[in-house]
């Protein structure tokens, strides 16, 4: 006899990176007929939702109107059909951004390089942090971690035209509290276009993730669809 129901899916809309004082919706999708959903935060019960009518609803939304550092962390959800509870969902890492200061991002030898050249990004933040994150916009939005007292190096090695794009960095005060994003740095790589097919794509983010994050920062708009898949959050673990 089945002791638990299948685990639900959890994600954040419009994005798992939430500027402080902006809103975010945490979605939990279970099964039709679920009479109760529970959202847990760092191991404690955070919120409850009882969908009506349960037989016509398989997803609930928990609204956080005012993001702050106290709400940044790991979330999971469970649901109940009758007396039977589900397995917990995967963990959703909710990150608060725009905390404290803005780092400076620079690139060596410069923003315009030739394919095959070694390129290094430098992210600098003078306030107390030792972890930095470098993000590249776009479909394969690659996230790297770096460490240093006030500055982290991000060596890209010999670049190809696949490294072209716009980069930003964050200082991280802990896994779930990040600084403002740096100003963007656009890397232009010229070279043999045929080499680009050899560059591995890193499907860390959906295509418009960064654009959605910027939309959140600038306008606080809510988008009513899932852009974020929990598997992408492996970058935080």
């Amino acid at each position: 006899q089945q002791q638990t129901l299948p685990k639900p899916f959890i994600w954040a809309e419009p994005h798992f990176m939430v500027p402080k004082e902006k809103q975010v919706t945490i979605c939990c999708q279970g099964n039709y007929g679920a009479v109760e959903y529970q959202l847990h935060f760092e191991g404690s019960l955070f919120a409850v939702d009882r969908p009506k009518p349960p037989e016509r609803i398989n997803k609930v939304k928990f609204y956080i109107p005012d993001m702050n550092s106290r709400m940044a962390g790991q979330y999971s959800c469970i649901y109940r059909v009758g007396e039977l509870w589900s397995e917990p969902s995967n963990l959703l890492d909710l990150v608060v951004t725009e905390m404290y200061d803005t780092p400076t991002l620079s690139v060596h030898p410069g923003p315009e390089v030739i394919s095959g050249e070694k390129v290094t990004f430098y992210c600098r933040l003078d306030t107390a942090t030792s972890m930095f994150l470098l993000l590249k916009e776009g479909r394969s939005s690659h996230v790297q971690r770096g460490y240093g007292k006030v500055q982290a190096e991000f060596p890209l090695g010999p670049v190809t035209t696949a490294h072209r794009g716009t980069y930003r960095c964050f200082g991280s005060y802990n896994n779930h509290a990040w600084s403002f994003p740096s100003e963007p740095v656009k890397l232009l790589v010229t070279g043999d276009i045929e080499n680009t097919s050899l560059a591995p794509e890193d499907p860390t983010f959906p295509a418009d993730t960064w654009g959605t994050y910027l939309l959140t920062t600038e306008t606080g708009l809510q988008k009513d669809h899932a852009l974020w898949d929990h598997t992408a959050q492996n970058l935080l673990r």
Epitope: F41, S44, L45, F46, A47, V48, D49, R50, P51, K52, V60, K61, F62, Y63, I64, P65, D66, N68, R70, M71
Partner: nanobody, 126 residues
């Protein structure tokens, strides 16, 4: 901006009853999820009861069956009916709101609440 003002606290004997009220200013009350928390001397603030916009409720195990949370949107007021009071119920009781929110959301964690009242003291002693 939402302002919350609690009233109804006081001294009561064990086994007695009290009704706390929380008056909310502004037109946002109907779009708010509400909750009651309490803080005993020297202890952390703890969840007591919460109610959604659609009147779904959730209670801490320690008060289930003894306390009832309710709301009157026409009067912009939240209530906590407390009965069978015990010495361990002695605390400052705080009313809190999450504004805005979805209809069925009931918030249990204090971090979720973005508006708080100043509190009203409830003392249970013989």
């Amino acid at each position: 901006e939402v302002q919350l003002v609690e009233s109804g606290g006081g001294e009561v004997q064990p086994g007695g009853s009290l009704r706390l009220s929380c008056a909310a200013s502004g037109r946002t009350f109907a779009s708010a999820a509400m909750g009651w928390f309490r803080q005993a001397p020297g202890k952390e603030r703890e969840f007591v009861a919460a109610i959604s916009r659609s009147d779904d409720t959730y209670y801490a195990e320690s008060v289930k069956g003894r306390f009832t949370i309710s709301r009157d949107n026409a009067k912009n007021t939240l209530y906590l009916q407390m009965s069978s009071l015990r010495a361990e119920d002695t605390a400052v009781y705080y009313c809190a709101a999450v504004v805005p929110t979805y209809g069925n959301n009931i918030y249990v964690h204090s971090a979720a609440y973005n508006y708080w009242g100043q509190g009203t003291l409830v003392t249970v002693k013989p």
